[in-house]
């Protein structure tokens, strides 16, 4: 029997043991989060699988993920949403300490997919473990990119109160219009629900004492947000190590001075 021809993509293939990983993460999440205990993880996996299995992996739509989004519906309390751009590790370290604030990856759907890759093949029920479309070299409407665009949009749409965003001050473009934050989340914050966006610009180098809130790209972000009738605030986090330490131990005397 000749092996069936398989499309070769430029990106790495589906993460090994993808179905088992998603299912295990779902079970773990619903055990730890009482408000999600009603979720049936087999149904979640079936909806996830249904979004990309048997479909051409360069023609995935946000519509494909709607059944999954519906099953994973979750609300974040007002003032507790933390967005991030190009500084995922620190954002996650922060919400691990500040347990009442949430990044997308602290929500069920983000938690399920974080750091995973997946894709299927047209007209077969197989998962492609060999290769998946690369956003740049193959197509942008691939299963992974469309998933994150879909859940990021929903996460931003449901945010309320003061929304925070952590930005990487070590980059030459601190705010990038092409990032998920710049191209999706910023434009889906709802002015009738969101009073303000507060940016935390995280300094990378210990010798860097500049006011990065004056950076031209931050001014660009301020302009976009203000035009949407949302107030904008910005804070430099000069000492992210101290910042995290003070979140853990707010009573520490050194936390009374600036960070």
């Amino acid at each position: 029997v000749l092996p069936r021809w398989r499309q070769q993509w430029s990106g790495s293939g589906t993460t090994s043991r993808f179905p088992e990983t998603v299912l295990a993460r779902c079970v773990k999440y619903t055990e730890v989060h009482p408000e999600m205990r009603h979720v049936d993880c087999q149904s979640v996996w079936d909806a996830f699988k249904g979004a990309f299995i048997s479909k051409y992996p360069c023609n995935i739509t946000e519509e494909d993920y709607q059944p999954l989004v519906k099953l994973g519906t979750q609300t974040v309390p007002c003032n507790k949403t933390l967005l991030w751009s190009r500084i995922k590790d620190l954002a996650h370290q922060f919400t691990q300490v500040q347990r009442d604030m949430f990044t997308l990856e602290d929500m069920l759907l983000g938690y399920l997919a974080d750091d995973l890759t997946w894709c299927g093949e047209f007209n077969t029920f197989e998962i492609n473990y060999q290769s998946c479309p690369d956003w740049r070299k193959d197509c942008s409407n691939n299963p992974v990119s469309v998933f994150w665009k879909t859940v990021s949009r929903r996460f931003a749409e449901t945010a309320c109160g003061v929304v925070h965003v952590m930005l990487n001050g070590s980059r030459s473009k601190i705010f990038d219009k092409n990032s998920t934050f710049g191209s999706v989340e910023v434009h889906n914050l709802q002015p009738e629900k969101v009073q303000a966006l507060e940016a935390w610009v995280i300094h990378g180098g210990r010798e860097d004492s500049r006011d990065l809130c004056q950076d031209p790209t931050i001014k660009e972000l301020e302009s976009i947000i203000s035009k949407r009738n949302i107030r904008f605030f910005c804070k430099n986090i000069y000492r992210p190590d101290k910042f995290l330490q003070c979140v853990k131990n707010p009573e520490d005397s050194s936390c009374l001075s600036g960070i």
Epitope: D89, R136, K173, N178, I202, G205, E207
Partner: antibody
């Protein structure tokens, strides 16, 4: 003076393992991200792996994911690269390199490099 | 095939000015800093330019870096025979979550 001294290279068969070490001196090791970069014979530079200053986060090139593990022992001022399931295409000079600025959380570019250690994968 | 594209070779005569280009995309050069390295034959790479256009101490001001959009350039003025080496650009890529090096440019001083 900042110094980086790699060791642990050698000849190994395909499928074998090797552990590279990089002894650092002349700077506060625990304040800097560290990287491994390799150069195959007659080829260009290829980044392999990076580890943050405190060792909390790492990132690897796709070509070595699942096979190579970067780690560090800040008490010994030493960086490591554990290389498993070695392939012929892993044959290269492996350089250890120090991150540029003292960083809190992120990876940054390499400013000082060691002289390299040679890894040959051949049967 | 490298994601950062450099010409494989460049040349010039002593005293001349040469420019080496490095082309990337909006997930690397456009959003992050570019670094340039010089590798003399048989030696380890040496940092030449950091954060697009900054020179580390000890690097002659004959070397300069610039960036515009998704491309960067290294210029060497007053070319000297000791500049004969391989030159590499490097930057971080967000999509790949990795450092990238250009394929390298071999500079020959004629």
């Amino acid at each position: 003076e900042v110094q980086l001294l790699e060791s642990g290279g050698g000849l190994v068969q395909p499928g074998g393992s090797l552990r590279l070490s990089c002894a650092a001196s002349g700077f506060t090791f625990e304040d800097y991200a560290m990287s491994w970069v390799r150069q195959a014979p007659g080829k260009g530079l290829e980044w392999v792996s990076v580890i943050s200053s405190k060792g909390g986060s790492t990132s690897n090139a796709d070509s070595v994911k699942g096979r190579f593990t970067i780690s560090r022992d800040n008490s010994k001022n030493t960086l490591y690269l554990q290389m498993n399931s070695l392939r012929a295409e892993d044959t290269a000079v492996y350089y250890c390199a120090k991150g540029m600025e003292r960083q809190y959380y992120s990876y940054n570019a390499m400013d000082v490099w060691g002289q390299g250690t040679t890894v040959t994968v051949s049967s | 095939q490298s994601v950062l594209t450099q010409p494989p070779s460049a040349s010039g005569t002593p005293g001349q000015r040469v420019t080496i280009s490095c082309s990337g995309s909006n997930s690397n050069i456009d959003v992050d800093y570019v670094y340039w390295y010089q590798q003399l034959p048989g030696t380890a790479p040496r940092l030449l330019i950091y954060k697009d256009d900054q020179r580390p101490s000890g690097v002659p001001d004959r070397f300069s870096g610039s960036k515009s959009g998704t491309s960067a350039s290294l210029a060497i003025s007053g070319l000297q025979s000791e500049d004969e080496a391989d030159y590499y650009c490097a930057t971080w890529d967000d999509n790949l979550n990795s450092w990238l090096f250009g394929g390298g440019t071999k500079l020959t001083v004629l």
